[in-house]
């Protein structure tokens, strides 16, 4: 009899944190709140949404999830946002969300129902049991990429990018070593799913972190890499430095302010 060193399945320890506590209640509550606030989504049955969400990962091996598993949820969460008002972001979620909270006619993925439901949550199940795993879930790097959370975000991000048209904006973190990261969701999914037949221009907003940082971060090699990828896809590329994010937000709130005519 050979002694296998792997942990028995029912005690499987993944490298990532487990499902967010009160996950079902959180998803359901968020759905109810969202559909109350957004009249165009009032028709959505939140119990059905939860059932479809649950059905995507419960009783399935958490390293064997596919986009197909999420299709029932995608169908229930179908939503039309103005295709020319889309804001993508990479590694700078908080500022992107602060921006769309002020500029109400623009939308990040997390301003849509499905993005709002899952934002900052973790979830996974176990093969052949209806249990939710609250102890641990697979880490994208250390365990597997086809885990419930990663596949969800890949699916909704792809659909969001595919829906975009005209000028698409993306907020990028100028404080990172890789301002544009090919391995981010933006770099690996969204960039490649913008449709040239619909999207004319991708406009990058590079957000500066340092108070005295006056460098032109649009000259950064990773921005030039993004420019090259986008141009090869027959989409125009535009890049703007946001030197003062605090002032930028303030000027979005009060565009008439006299100090808002200069470069931000």
């Amino acid at each position: 009899h050979h002694h296998h060193h792997h942990v028995p399945r029912w005690r499987q320890q993944w490298s990532g944190p487990g499902t967010t506590k009160r996950f079902p209640e959180t998803v359901l509550a968020r759905c109810v709140k969202y559909t109350e606030i957004h009249p165009e989504m009032r028709h959505v049955d939140c119990q059905s949404v939860w059932d479809a969400f649950k059905g995507a990962f419960i009783s399935k091996h958490p390293c064997n999830i596919t986009e197909e598993d999420y299709q029932p949820l995608m169908k229930l969460g179908t939503q039309t946002v103005p295709c020319n008002k889309i804001l993508l972001w990479s590694r700078i979620k908080d500022l992107a969300h602060q921006f769309t909270q002020v500029q109400r006619d623009m939308f990040t993925l997390e301003d849509t129902l499905l993005g709002y439901l899952a934002d900052d949550l973790t979830w996974c199940g176990e093969f052949n049991t209806s249990k939710i795993n609250y102890q641990s879930c697979p880490d994208w790097r250390k365990d597997c990429s086809n885990n419930p959370v990663s596949v969800f975000w890949k699916t909704v991000s792809r659909r969001f990018a595919e829906a975009a048209c005209d000028v698409v904006h993306v907020m990028l973190n100028g404080s990172r070593s890789k301002i544009f990261d090919k391995n981010s969701t933006f770099g690996s999914v969204e960039v490649h799913n913008l449709q040239p037949e619909k999207v004319q221009t991708l406009e990058a907003w590079v957000i500066h972190g340092g108070r005295e940082d006056s460098r032109d971060l649009c000259q950064d090699p990773t921005i030039k890499e993004l420019e090259s990828i986008i141009s090869k896809r027959n989409i125009q590329f535009s890049c703007k430095n946001i030197y003062r994010p605090d002032k930028f937000l303030q000027c979005v709130k009060n565009p008439e302010d006299s100090s808002c005519t200069s470069e931000i």
Partner: antibody
Framework: QVQLQESGPGLVKPSETLSLTCTVS????????IHWIRQPPGKGLEWIGV???????DYNPSLKSRVTISKDNSKSQVSLKLSSVTAADTAVYYC?????????????WGQGTLVTVSS | EIVMTQSPPTLSLSPGERVTLSCRAS??????LVWYQQKPGQAPRLLIS???SLETSIPARFSGSGSGTDYTLTISSLQPEDFAVYYC?????????FGQGTKVEIK
Amino acid sequence: QVQLQESGPGLVKPSETLSLTCTVSGFSLTSYGIHWIRQPPGKGLEWIGVIWRGGSTDYNPSLKSRVTISKDNSKSQVSLKLSSVTAADTAVYYCAKGKVTTGFYFDFWGQGTLVTVSS
Amino acid sequence: EIVMTQSPPTLSLSPGERVTLSCRASEDIYNRLVWYQQKPGQAPRLLISGVTSLETSIPARFSGSGSGTDYTLTISSLQPEDFAVYYCQQYWSTPYTFGQGTKVEIK
């Protein structure tokens, strides 16, 4: 403010090389692409080619074998060379700035320079 | 290459009249269309991009419409300074190509 100015000889002999320079101000060549467009007298506009901010180029296939666009970022200058010219190359030559970083249409133009090909 | 055809070649009109200029592409250009205005001895001036987006400082009497292969520039009420040649340009694929122009002249 943004300005572009073309300069170069107004008369070129057939079979020789036409050389023009576009000097820009009000923006950096490391931030925008520069396009060359020409217009024969009394006729329409023809796109010649572009040098992107990173230095790569795209040319009109009808002229590709004869055209070279290069630039010197520090001098804010872009140059156009068109070899083996004939009378058909007589035109007003314009340089123009792409509207966005990598822009496929043009928001600022030079005033144009007339080049006549004649012996 | 994509061939852009403008019609009519010339329009003779009076100030105050409504003008409609047509531009047709030899294939779908997916709304990648701009309009320029050119006056004698001057460089072209960008009026409209992406079919409908008016450039800053261009008067609201100018408007654009269309999709697929057929596009239109409209001047709602012709002003004396609007007499010029108008060119459309596609930027869907290289080489970027222009229409042959429509001359709007005073009747």
